[in-house]
């Protein structure tokens, strides 16, 4: 009898340690990438920013990987991706090339199953960046609710490179995963 | 025998109970505050925000305290920290010592335990705004993912504040915790 | 016995599952909508945007309800709110009315039971187009954390809809619960 | 050296007009917003006129408003203010004052001061 | 408009001595309130911003407190260079309002 119940206790436990494992907070995958400052793109055109810290002041990562300059999906589920984008110059910096600017980040998606890229969220602003002014400062911030499968991956572009303000509070991005999949 | 049984439960209900208390949506700190306008001091490029409204309107707080003008933790966590804040000038308001400006905000963590405060999140644009146009308007948003621990302070510096929208839709910060920490 | 100890079991089983059915990660409420291009009103007062998409492309929906152009709430809940609305005007679409635009989103929530309306977030820049740029951008991005009631409606107003983008990536809100009312 | 230097005032007879004009030197005058302040016989301080930086924001008292215009001209590195529908309480001795702030761009406190010009109003 | 009071209107010291003088506002200005100094036939300097920020190159026996509606210059140890009258400013509300002034006079 009395092993009888513990079989069953077994079987009850069993279970709960797997929703345990499930729904435990710690288990949910995140990641928030701060620029790496020294290996910016020069140049106006749009690029794909690949350096990135994920293991210094606020940046960090779990239960997903970084590498190649972008943001590796472990673990398929809802995830919650935002990304802020601070562009910046100042006149000691020397003359723009035009006053005249496009200040633009896309958060995009590719999957290596499929090879191919999609934009998930766009954002920023054209801007006219006079002369008459000594300094200059523009962020653009999005964020939104995405369905990501394991080996899905992220990956930030941005128009201007080179006007990129390289503080970590200034220029990262990031996702959590907020749910599982149906 | 059911003496037994009952023990044996007692101790699946115990653990299940202290995975519920874990689990519990509910037990999640959160904070929503909105902005309350009177007396901004001046006197700096940047100054703190120390008055807002946690309990009416769209203000809220749970497991979390205000105190000070700062948005302290009590639970160690992953928090996604967010903040709008918005800028607004009429000509009906008065001049502009300047057209040119610098719109700001400064999403600041302060450690009590080693007094020092670090920027996490920072957003803005330099603004031409003319006194041909009778109407100004521009909103900053920033959102990002932060590891927390309990004691810590989130407060909230802007620059230009007598040009702040005091609505509570406009200018106002937040956080949700959304996992603990391994 | 056994009887008395499969009993003793259902009981456990009985409340795990709902614990199970509370805190598992899928049954949490979530929305995606992206803009519907062929469906956007004309002009440049504030309107309500009615078309979106809940089911293709990036747009999706679950445990909520998307009806007569608003974002109803099934689950009551706090939830983060999120929108990133992005307008654009190039050159060969024609002369703008005016130079001077007030490019601004407004988040809504809508009660049936009491008919009112309120704005839970606003964002926005008013900004000088000029014909001397052959394409202007910009975008705004809004979020925070509501507590919503079943029952209630979300919906997004912009001005100058004629202005918007049509993409996927660029206009866009949604929602996802983050945990239950105390 | 950062300097202004007022010039313009006169003795003129009520309901007439003048031109007051401020030199300045030293600093980027385009980066800042300027003021005119006056000080009445009985060495109160008045506030009169103030421009923006770039000219687009003009600001008046009550008592001076449709009567007096403040301008300014960049590339001369000169204010002006122009008066008319003069009066006897607009005798004074007239100040020419950079504005400045720290925080906000609606503030302003009066850094740097000109030596003054004097304008008499007969009647 | 905000109406500043200035008290004393009339103060007389001996050097070495250390003086207050007060600015009241007619509605809170929160520290939006500035010091000048002006010297008999000179124009006004300016000694505190923002209630109790100094300004570069004035000594450091100028200092200024308060918040909201009362204010206070103080001057540690007065000089003879210190004498003539003392205004302050605000510029929370538009228009911008000085005080009366405060002459401080030679004992």
């Known amino acids: 009898g009395s092993q009888h119940i513990r079989a069953e206790k077994a079987m009850v436990d069993g279970s709960w340690l797997d929703l345990a494992k499930r729904s435990k907070l710690e288990a949910q995958p995140f990641a928030h990438l701060t620029i790496n400052a020294t290996d910016i793109p020069s140049g106006s055109h749009k690029v794909s920013l690949s350096s990135w810290y994920h293991d210094r002041g606020w940046g960090k990562i779990s239960n997903m990987t970084f590498s190649n300059g972008k943001l590796i999906v472990n673990q398929d589920g809802f995830y919650y991706l935002y990304a802020n984008i601070c562009f910046r110059h100042h006149e000691t910096s020397g003359d723009l090339a035009t006053e005249y600017l496009q200040l633009m980040v896309y958060v995009t998606k590719t999957s290596i199953k499929i090879p191919s890229s999609h934009t998930l969220m766009k954002g920023g602003s054209t801007k006219y960046w006079s002369g008459n002014s000594e300094f200059h400062f523009y962020s653009i911030n999005v964020g939104g609710f995405f369905k990501l499968r394991s080996g899905e991956e992220i990956s930030i572009e941005v128009s201007n490179p080179s006007l990129l303000d390289p503080d970590q509070d200034a220029t990262y991005f990031g996702a959590f995963k907020v749910r599982d999949i149906d | 025998g059911s003496q037994h049984i009952r023990a044996e439960k007692a101790m699946v209900d115990g653990s299940w109970l202290d995975l519920a208390k874990r689990s519990k949506l509910e037990a999640q700190p959160f904070a929503h505050l909105t902005i309350n306008a009177t007396d901004i001091p001046s006197g700096s490029h940047k100054v703190s925000l120390s008055s807002w409204y946690h309990d009416r309107g769209w203000g809220k707080i749970s497991n979390m305290t205000f105190s000070n003008g700062k948005l302290i933790v009590n639970q160690d966590g992953f928090y996604y920290l967010y903040a709008n804040i918005c800028f607004r000038h009429h000509e009906t308001s008065g001049d502009l010592a300047t057209e040119y400006l610098q719109l700001m905000v400064y999403v600041t963590k302060t450690s009590i335990k080693i007094p020092s405060s670090h920027t996490l999140m920072k957003g803005g644009s330099t603004k031409y705004w003319s006194g041909n146009s009778e109407f100004h308007f521009y909103s900053i948003n920033v959102g990002g993912f932060f590891k927390l621990r309990s004691g810590e302070e989130i407060s909230i510096e802007v620059s230009n504040p007598s040009l702040l929208d005091p609505d509570q839709d406009a200018t106002y910060f937040g956080a949700f915790k959304v996992r603990d920490i391994d | 016995g056994s009887q008395h100890i499969r009993a003793e079991k259902a009981m456990v089983d009985g409340s795990w599952l709902d614990l199970a059915k509370r805190s598992k990660l899928e049954a949490q409420p979530f929305a995606h909508l992206t803009i519907n291009a062929t469906d956007i009103p004309s002009g440049s007062h504030k309107v309500s945007l009615s078309s979106w998409y809940h089911d293709r492309g990036w747009g999706k929906i679950s445990n909520m309800t998307f009806s007569n152009g608003k974002l109803i709430v099934n689950q009551d809940g706090f939830y983060y709110l999120y929108a990133n609305i992005c307008f654009r005007h190039h050159e060969t679409s024609g002369d703008l009315a005016t130079e001077y635009l007030q490019l601004m989103v407004y988040v809504t929530k809508t009660s049936i039971k009491i008919p009112s309306s309120h704005t839970l977030m606003k964002g926005g820049s008013t900004k000088y187009w000029s014909g001397n740029s052959e394409f202007h951008f910009y975008s705004i991005n809004v979020g925070g954390f509501f507590k919503l009631r079943s029952g209630e409606e979300i919906s997004i107003e912009v001005s100058n809809p004629s202005l918007l983008d049509p993409d996927q990536d660029a206009t866009y809100f949604g929602a996802f619960k983050v945990r239950d009312i105390d | 050296e950062v300097q202004l230097v007022e010039s313009g005032g006169d003795l003129v007879k009520s309901g007439g007009s003048l031109k007051l004009s401020c030199a300045a030197s030293?600093?980027?005058?385009?980066?800042?917003?300027m003021s005119w302040v006056r000080q009445t016989p009985d060495k109160r301080l008045e506030w009169v006129a103030s421009i923006s930086s770039g000219g687009t924001y003009t600001s008046y008292p009550d008592s001076v408003k449709g009567r007096f215009t403040i301008t300014r001209d960049s590339a001369k590195n000169t204010l002006y203010l122009q008066m008319s529908s003069l009066k006897s309480e607009d005798t004074a001795m007239y100040y020419c004052?950079?504005?400045?702030?720290?925080?906000?761009?609606?503030?302003?406190?009066?850094?740097?001061w000109g030596a003054g010009t004097t304008v008499t109003v007969s009647s | 408009d905000t109406v500043l009071t200035q008290s004393p209107a009339t103060l007389s010291v001996t050097p070495g001595a250390s003086v207050s003088l007060s600015c009241r506002a007619s509605?809170?200005?929160?520290?939006?309130l500035h010091w000048y100094q002006q010297k008999s036939h000179e124009s006004p300097r300016l000694l505190i911003i923002?209630?109790?920020q100094s300004i570069s190159g004035i000594p450091s026996r100028f200092s200024g407190s308060g918040s909201g509606t009362d204010f206070t210059l103080s001057i540690n140890s007065v000089e003879t260079e210190d004498f003539g009258v003392y205004f302050c400013?605000?510029?929370?509300?538009?228009?911008?309002?000085f005080g009366g002034g405060t002459k401080l006079e030679i004992k």
């Open positions: 400013q605000q510029s929370n509300s538009w228009p911008f309002t």
């Open positions: 004052a950079r504005r400045n702030f720290i925080t906000s761009a609606t503030d302003c406190y009066f850094d740097v």
């Open positions: 923002y209630a109790s």
């Open positions: 030293g600093f980027t005058f385009s980066r800042y917003g």
């Open positions: 509605q809170s200005i929160s520290n939006n």
